[in-house]
């Protein structure tokens, strides 16, 4: 296993609709053919997998149909979007990148992006 540097923003604020986007960029010494990207959430010393996708370079990322993640790639940059976030989902979201093919296997883990989610205030009833 070879180490690889992965960069991601330190902080992102989710939109009022519970959508957060950030770029995960990996520094590889060459172009991989097959890449796996995993988003992990760390909160209260617990780490859980949020979503994962394997893609062929030059093709779109394909997450599972019921995944809360979508993404696109350009070169070594992966643009990740996480949807359906609520205040309770605030936490550190870590980008993990694996170069699956060709060998050797490279692994990189980012320092994490702190995503803050604020639930929108309910609209007050209005009389017309």
């Amino acid at each position: 296993c070879k180490a690889m540097h992965v960069a991601q923003p330190a902080v992102v604020l989710a939109s009022s609709r519970g959508i957060a986007s950030f770029v995960c960029e990996y520094a590889s010494p060459g172009k991989a053919t097959e890449v796996r990207v995993t988003v992990l959430r760390q909160a209260d010393s617990q780490v859980t997998e949020v979503c994962a996708a394997t893609y062929m370079m030059g093709n779109e990322l394909t997450f599972l149909d019921d995944s809360i993640c979508t993404g696109t790639s350009s070169g070594n940059q992966v643009n990740l979007t996480i949807q359906g976030l609520r205040a309770m989902d605030t936490g550190l979201y870590i980008c993990k990148v694996e170069l699956m093919y060709p060998p050797p296997y490279y692994l990189g883990i980012g320092n994490g992006t702190q995503i803050y989610v604020i639930d929108p205030e309910p609209c007050p009833d209005s009389d017309f």
């Epitope: 520094a27 590889s28 010494p29 060459g30 172009k31 991989a32 053919t33 350009s74 070169g75 070594n76 170069l99 060709p102 060998p103 050797p104 490279y106």
Partner: antibody, heavy 119, light 107 residues
Framework: DVQLQESGPGLVKPSQSLSLTCSVT?????????WNWIRQFPGNKLEWMGH???????NYNPSLINRISITRDTSKNQFFLKLSSVTTEDTATYFC????????????WGQGTSVTVSS | DIQMTQSPSSLSASLGGKVTITCKAS??????IGWYQHKPGKGPRLLIY???TLQPGIPSRFSGSGSGRDYSLSIRNLEPEDIATYYC?????????FGSGTKLEIK
């Protein structure tokens, strides 16, 4: 530590074939990476010639496609360059090197071997 | 093929000083660039890959930057052992192509 070492004749006659060997120690050429030949002309210009992958697939520089062949002997952990129909323009220092991925930056190089094409 | 236009072809600087070498690609290479140091009688030595990532064992005096078509290598606190020829190389597409080289001399 990974080491690459080029070897072959230092003098080749025009119209003949140039054959060079790259011997690799410290890493199996079948375990990963792409194994390359690069040459440096007398004016210092570097030219990528081609490579062979860990699983034996080749890519060549289109400028050499009709004259070049890169092969390997996995039992000896060596790979080879054959350049046919050489001219004086092929006089250069020839390097072998490795890189990761289908295209990449070369992290290990041999020290190079000088080849002169002359009658 | 992607052309890599490297400049200057040579430069002279003082010990302890700083130099910057540039490479311009003929198209966007998406940060897929490496930089090498080459001394006579040896193979080139990889300094930096993916624009700015230092190869293990390379001193932090070396740094790289850029995006799109424009890239640069900087060397600060120049030392006598930095005397060499420096090359850029793109790895966005085959065939792999190199810059023409920059010969660094110390005043």
């Amino acid at each position: 530590d990974v080491q690459l070492q080029e070897s072959g004749p230092g003098l080749v006659k025009p119209s003949q074939s140039l054959s060079l060997t790259c011997s690799v120690t410290g890493y199996s050429i079948t375990s990963g990476f792409y194994w390359n030949w690069i040459r440096q002309f007398p004016g210092n210009k570097l030219e990528w010639m081609g490579h062979i992958s860990h699983d034996g697939r080749n890519n060549y520089n289109p400028s050499l496609i009709n004259r070049i062949s890169i092969t390997r002997d996995t039992s000896k952990n060596q790979f080879f360059l054959k350049l046919s129909s050489v001219t004086t323009e092929d006089t250069a220092t020839y390097f072998c090197a490795r890189h990761y991925g289908s295209s990449g930056a070369m992290d290990y190089w041999g020290q190079g071997t000088s080849v002169t094409v002359s009658s | 093929d992607i052309q890599m236009t490297q400049s200057p072809s040579s430069l002279s600087a003082s010990l302890g000083g700083k130099v910057t070498i540039t490479c311009k690609a003929s198209q966007d290479i998406k940060k897929y660039i490496g930089w090498y140091q080459h001394k006579p009688g040896k193979g080139p030595r990889l300094l930096i890959y993916y624009t700015s990532t230092l190869q293990p064992g390379i001193p932090s005096r070396f740094s790289g930057s850029g995006s799109g078509r424009d890239y640069s290598l900087s060397i600060r606190n120049l030392e006598p052992e930095d005397i060499a020829t420096y090359y850029c190389q793109q790895y966005d597409n085959l065939p792999l192509t190199f810059g023409s080289g920059t010969k660094l001399e110390i005043k």
